[in-house]
Interface confidence: medium
């Protein structure tokens, strides 16, 4: 006993030795080391039945979806899928694990969030962490060179998620993307068309739509004097900038990341702008950024993509934004994200926007990435942020304290005196074969004040009542549960007076 | 506490011209942009120009474009608008204003003005 | 370029009354929009920016919405110290433009 009290002390001096190292951002080799150590020791600990430690609960960054949750989600995907499929999308679907090799070298210092499996007969696998490798892989795969696919499903990362934000280690994404060869800015402009209708359909907001291109990016920082190797740590600090001032960004560039003062304030002239087609102008009259061929080519791709969003009807929603530059390694041109646009108590307290919504971008160069010749398949796509949209909906609902519906019953069929229950029975099959979504309770002789409780609870608007009397008659009792009418349907007219007042199609077509 | 102050109005012929000045103190003056909008008398308010942080970038309205020249002295923590070919409209009271790009493109912080008068 | 148009130009109220300004934009400019207060002989003041965020300092009597086109400015109960001219202006585009104000007088 005084034996596994000495190694429980020890488990907790190295378990804080550990949690001390990963604060001082200690070398990760020193951290893996020390963390071996613990196991280690755990190991020789053992289980303890004395102690029943175990807690019931779902995985960190993991949550249980409830009915009602589960409603919420369902009418998001409703209108998703609804917009995906009215601009002539295919759906595919794909493994929820993929070979680890396919995911390496596609996400930049986001790698080290994949989620990798433990051996499998020999095959390395890894969680998959977005939809649009595995979409590539499949491109390549089965030699396709032209699709318009969406995709729903769930991803997986080992981020430290701030659920309250709507963030987790598993949540879904929804996915559109367009791949093939065609004329510039056309699927990119649909793609933004299809942002805003879901974003709008939502009413979730008023929301904004950032623009920039991975080329102008590229050619700014290569004009301002940075060097490759700086880039992406220098994306990370400009792409602050919604949420920080400058000076706090060219603070962090400077002190923390070593770049030259007079390079950040070269950047710094740059990123701080935003606007319409008008600031795309003004950039290709600027003397050293329409010197650089790529930001050339990205600035002449934006204004004919401005052209075509203001057709489209929503270049009102669209900022052209130099400071957007976040997104993973493999876009190659433009790239935009979508934010919720909030109202802080006051100016400087929180940033405008309560997080991306969406976001996208053009990746010309993944696909060449798994075919053995390098050929490449031109990509553009968008992704919804289906969870924070969940949590904003889920709160609007909650401050409403709106009424979900969990069940779509449209009738629960019910008696009025006892020995009933055959009949029941009965009419409840006739209703379920003529397509009605129907109820009733698993009870011989339900009183009929509790089944018109459940109908009020459950949100079900008609009930069918069966009584001695109606089935001579050969009638049923038709009672709508909110105005609490009655009328006598004759049982054969009844399937067709349900989808009359409930507003489904007479036919199951 | 942020601090704007303008100076060099005053009375000038039509075609004439005139440099303004504007003293910023109590902030880091080369991260910011820098604006100058105008008021004409008893009129609204007109965005003339602004210039960025390290003097690279600047943009003027299409009323001055060629005539006035935005500059700015991170060393003297100072904003110029020099004013060529001067005309009647450009009669105004000229502020300079702290841009500040967060979020809008604002003046969160404003000089008193200095009063420019083109008459012959 | 973007016109911002006031309404109404001219408005009388007495103190403890609750006032609404109005702008609209030529085209739509999402949320780029921002509020300042001008008293004779001084400059202007800034009060809301992003339509509806509060710059800091600002009393919050004072309040924005809108989005898109249409946006209005709301002073909840008049104080003395708020009769001035109010501006809206438009951050969307360059050069940003101004609405031509309203006065708020006391009645």
């Known amino acids: 006993m005084a034996e596994r009290a000495a190694l429980e002390e020890l488990v907790k001096l190295q378990g804080e030795r550990v949690r001390g190292l990963k604060q001082q951002k200690a070398s990760a080799e020193l951290i893996e080391e020390e963390v071996a150590k613990l196991l280690k020791l755990k190991a020789q600990l053992g289980p303890d039945e004395s102690k029943q430690k175990f807690v019931l609960k779902t995985p960190k960054g993991t949550r249980d979806y409830s009915p009602r949750q589960m409603a919420v989600r369902e009418k998001v995907f409703d209108v998703i899928i609804r917009c995906f499929k009215r601009h002539g999308a295919e759906v595919i679907d794909t493994p929820v694990f993929e070979l680890k090799e396919t995911l390496m070298g596609k996400y930049g210092e986001d790698s080290k969030l994949i989620y990798d499996l433990k051996d499998q007969g020999g095959e390395l696998l890894s969680l998959r962490y977005d939809l649009t490798v595995p979409f590539a892989r499949y491109l390549a795969m089965n030699k396709l060179t032209n699709i318009k696919r969406y995709h729903i499903a769930k991803v997986y990362r080992r981020d430290n998620p701030a659920m309250t934000r709507g963030r987790y280690r598993e949540f879904y994404q929804c996915d559109f993307d367009i791949a093939g060869n065609f004329d510039p800015m056309i699927p990119d402009a649909e793609c933004l068309k299809i942002m805003c209708e879901i974003l709008s359909s939502l009413q979730i907001g008023d929301f904004l739509v950032k623009v920039n291109d991975r080329r102008i990016l590229d050619g700014m920082f290569a004009i301002c004097g940075v060097s490759d190797s700086k880039f992406r740590t220098i994306c990370s600090s400009v792409d602050k900038l919604d949420k920080v001032s400058w000076e706090e960004v060219k603070n962090e560039m400077v002190g923390e990341k070593g770049l030259a003062p007079e390079v950040a304030d070269r950047i710094g002239d740059y990123v701080q702008q935003h606007g319409g087609v008008s600031l795309v102008e003004q950039l290709l009259q600027d003397p050293k950024l329409s010197q650089n061929k790529q930001a050339l080519e990205g600035l002449g791709d934006l204004k004919l993509l401005f052209e075509y969003l203001t057709l489209f009807g929503i270049d009102d929603k669209i900022s052209f934004d130099l400071s957007l530059a976040r997104g993973l390694d493999y876009y190659t041109g433009v790239i935009y994200e979508a934010v919720l646009l909030q109202t802080p108590a006051q100016a400087g307290e929180e940033p405008l926007g309560v997080g991306s919504v969406a976001a996208g971008g053009r990746y010309d160069g993944l696909v060449g990435m798994f075919d053995p010749k390098g050929r490449k398949v031109p990509c553009v796509g968008l992704s919804i942020g289906v969870e924070r949209i969940f949590s904003i909906v889920e709160q609007r609902l909650e401050a409403l304290e709106e009424k979900i519906r969990t069940t779509e019953t449209q009738v629960l069929v019910a008696s009025a005196q006892k020995k009933l229950l055959e009949e029941r029975l009965k009419l409840v099959s006739e209703l379920w074969d003529a397509g009605i979504k129907a109820e009733l309770l698993y009870k011989k002789n339900p009183k009929l004040l509790n089944q018109l409780q459940y109908c009020e609870e459950a949100g079900i608007p008609l009930v069918a009542i069966i009584g001695e009397q109606e089935l001579k008659d050969g009638v049923i009792k038709l009672r709508s549960v909110t105005s609490r009418e009655e009328v006598d349907v004759r049982r054969e007219d009844l399937v067709e007076e349900i989808k009359r007042r409930t507003g489904q199609p007479l036919c199951i077509c | 506490q942020v601090q704007l102050v303008e100076s060099g109005g005053g009375l000038v012929k039509p075609g004439g011209s005139l440099r303004l000045s504007c003293a910023a103190s109590?902030?880091?003056?080369?991260?910011?942009?820098m604006t100058w909008i105008r008021q004409a008398p008893g009129k609204g308010l007109e965005w003339v120009s602004y210039?960025?942080?390290?003097?690279?970038?600047?943009n003027y309205a299409d009323s001055v474009k060629g005539r006035f020249t935005i500059s700015r002295d991170n060393a003297k923590n100072s904003l110029y608008l020099q004013m060529n070919s001067l005309r009647d409209e450009d009669t105004a009271v000229y502020f300079c204003?702290?841009?500040?790009?967060?979020?809008?493109?604002?003046?969160?912080?404003w000089g008193q003005g200095t009063l420019v008068t083109v008459s012959s | 370029d973007i016109q911002m148009t006031q309404s109404p130009s001219s408005v009388s109220a007495s103190v403890g009354d609750r006032v609404t300004i109005t702008c609209r934009a030529s085209?739509?400019?999402?949320?780029?929009l921002a509020w300042y207060q001008q008293k004779p002989g001084r400059a202007p003041k800034l009060l809301i920016f992003?339509?509806?965020s509060l710059q800091s300092g600002v009393p919050s009597r004072f309040s924005g919405s809108g989005s898109g086109t249409h946006f209005t400015l709301t002073i909840s109960s008049l104080q003395p110290e708020d009769f001035a001219t109010y501006y809206c202006q438009q951050a969307k585009s360059f050069p940003y433009t101004f609405g031509q104000g309203t006065k708020l007088e006391i009645k």
């Open positions: 992003a339509a509806s």
């Open positions: 109590g902030f880091t003056f080369s991260d910011y942009y």
């Open positions: 085209q739509g400019i999402s949320s780029w």
């Open positions: 210039i960025s942080g390290s003097n690279a970038y600047t």
């Open positions: 204003a702290r841009y500040v790009y967060q979020v809008v493109a604002i003046g969160d912080y």
